[in-house]
């Protein structure tokens, strides 16, 4: 149904080996990044923290889908993860490697 | 071509009458809101200020489009416009009505 397909956070496990980042990220081998999936139909729900522009764009799309594209379901808040990585050949620990995992999705 | 279809800001004129907002926005009759259109294919261009998560998601999508959706082209910076509007029956002028017009797009 439309509600089930609405913008929300869904699981997305990233295996660093699969994307070739295991060459510089030593640990962890992967992590739960999540992704934002689903539609942003008008009216946009409050928990999706839409901007005024997103509300207007969704409304225009509703009235004329040729004139404007839908607002898009994207990460609005990202969290860091901790990693062990190679920096100029030195194994380095970074407690907060920012912007890696989705904590909130919204319509933009 | 792919480059021509890449994430960028495109014109989108909003007529307040068309979306029913003329009931409370007295002036202007409309404005250039712009919208963000186009694809976010890996590698994501620097001017699209991709987050690490967006880069990873685009890379996963490139390798397996079933596993992750593409990163999305969305407004990353919004500008205000000036409006005359009705606030509890009082005609009010607001120099900076925030979040109305796209000034920059990016991949998220």
């Amino acid at each position: 149904n439309a509600k089930g397909n609405y913008c929300k956070r869904t699981p997305l496990y990233i295996d660093f080996k699969e994307i070739g980042w295991d060459s510089w990220i030593i640990a962890p081998p992967g992590y739960e990044a999540y992704e934002c999936r689903g539609v942003c139909n008008y009216p946009l729900a409050e928990h999706l923290t839409p901007t005024k522009h997103a509300i207007i764009q969704a409304l225009v799309h509703l009235k004329n889908s040729q004139k404007a594209s839908k607002a898009c379901c994207v990460p609005t808040k990202l969290e860091p993860i901790s990693i062990l990585y190679l920096d100029k050949g030195v194994v380095t620990y970074k407690f907060k490697y920012e912007g890696m995992a989705v904590s909130e999705c919204g319509c933009r | 071509n792919a480059k021509g279809n890449y994430c960028k800001r495109t014109p989108l004129y909003i007529d307040f009458k068309e979306i029913g907002w003329d009931s409370w926005i007295i002036a202007p009759p409309g404005y250039e809101a712009y919208e963000c259109r186009g694809v976010c294919n890996y590698p994501l261009a620097e001017h699209l200020t991709p987050t690490k998560h967006a880069i990873i998601q685009a890379l996963v999508h490139l390798k397996n489009s079933q596993k992750a959706s593409k990163a999305c082209c969305v407004p990353t910076k919004l500008e205000p416009i000036s409006i005359l509007y009705l606030d509890k029956g009082v005609v009010t002028y607001k120099f900076k009505y925030e979040g109305m017009a796209v000034s920059e797009c990016g991949c998220r």
Epitope: - | I26, P28, P29, Y31, Y93
Partner: antibody, heavy 115, light 111 residues
Framework: QVQLQESGPDLVQPSQTLDITCTVS????????VHWVRQPPGKGLEWMGT???????DYNSAFKDRLAISRDTSKNEVFLKMDSLQTDDTAVYFC?????????WGQGILVTVSS | QFALIQSDSMSTSAGSTVKLSCKRS????????VYWYQQHEGRSPTTMIY?????PDGVPDRFSGSIDSSSNSAFLTINDVQIEDEAVYFC??????????FGGGTKLTVL
């Protein structure tokens, strides 16, 4: 610093068209709004129209369909075009910047409509 | 469509207080903010009061704005009137039709 400068003809023949340019400096037309206001000799101020920062335009309905306002943001210019001028259109024409309030005015240009 | 009605002229003496009025013909004076402009002979106007009672930087605190709903009028009060206050004063408000409406102006003479 902020400046607005009107330029155009001093004299226009009746039934002809008036073209005035307001050249601005020290601010962006996508941030600030620009009013056109006129003042007949010895009389009051009359709002003609506004070029809004978002690109929308409003007109005083008293000028019906004979007024057109436009802009070129790359050149920092706002244009006023008014058709079918009559002698009672003789006035000083001002452009003015509207931010939180009208904080800067041009010096005005006196346009006389006469044959 | 309403009009803003101002008396054509007023005289006052230096050092006194003067109150210029701006009456709204129809509708409530409080239903939109009133702005006041000063215009010296041969010069461009300058804003003295905006949003009803706010003064732009550089405007002396001798100038103040107010409204009175019983007379459906806005007022510009000038305390300790100076010679340089001699000018024409215009009020302005908003409407949903003609978006920016000016009063006819009051010529203030300082004796």
């Amino acid at each position: 610093q902020v400046q607005l400068q009107e330029s155009g003809p001093d004299l226009v023949q009746p039934s002809q068209t008036l073209d005035i340019t307001c050249t601005v400096s020290g601010f962006s037309l996508t941030t600030y709004n620009v009013h056109w206001v006129r003042q007949p000799p010895g009389k009051g101020l009359e709002w003609m129209g506004t070029m809004w920062n978002g690109g929308g335009i409003d007109y005083n309905s008293a000028f019906k369909d004979r007024l057109a306002i436009s802009r070129d943001t790359s050149k920092n210019e706002v244009f006023l075009k008014m058709d079918s001028l009559q002698t009672d259109d003789t006035a000083v024409y001002f452009c003015a910047r509207l931010g939180y309030y009208v904080d800067y005015w041009g010096q005005g240009i006196l346009v006389t409509v006469s044959s | 469509q309403f009009a803003l009605i101002q008396s054509d002229s007023m005289s006052t003496s230096a050092g006194s207080t003067v109150k210029l009025s701006c009456k709204r013909s129809t509708g409530n004076i409080g239903s939109s903010y009133v702005y006041w402009y000063q215009q010296h002979e041969g010069r461009s106007p300058t804003t003295m009061i905006y949003d009803g009672d706010k003064r732009p930087d550089g405007v002396p605190d001798r100038f103040s704005g107010s409204i009175d709903s019983s007379s459906n009028s806005a007022f510009l009060t000038i305390n300790d009137v100076q010679i340089e206050d001699e000018a024409v004063y215009f009020c302005q408000s908003f409407s949903s039709g003609i978006k920016f409406i000016f009063g006819g102006g009051t010529k203030l003479t300082v004796l």
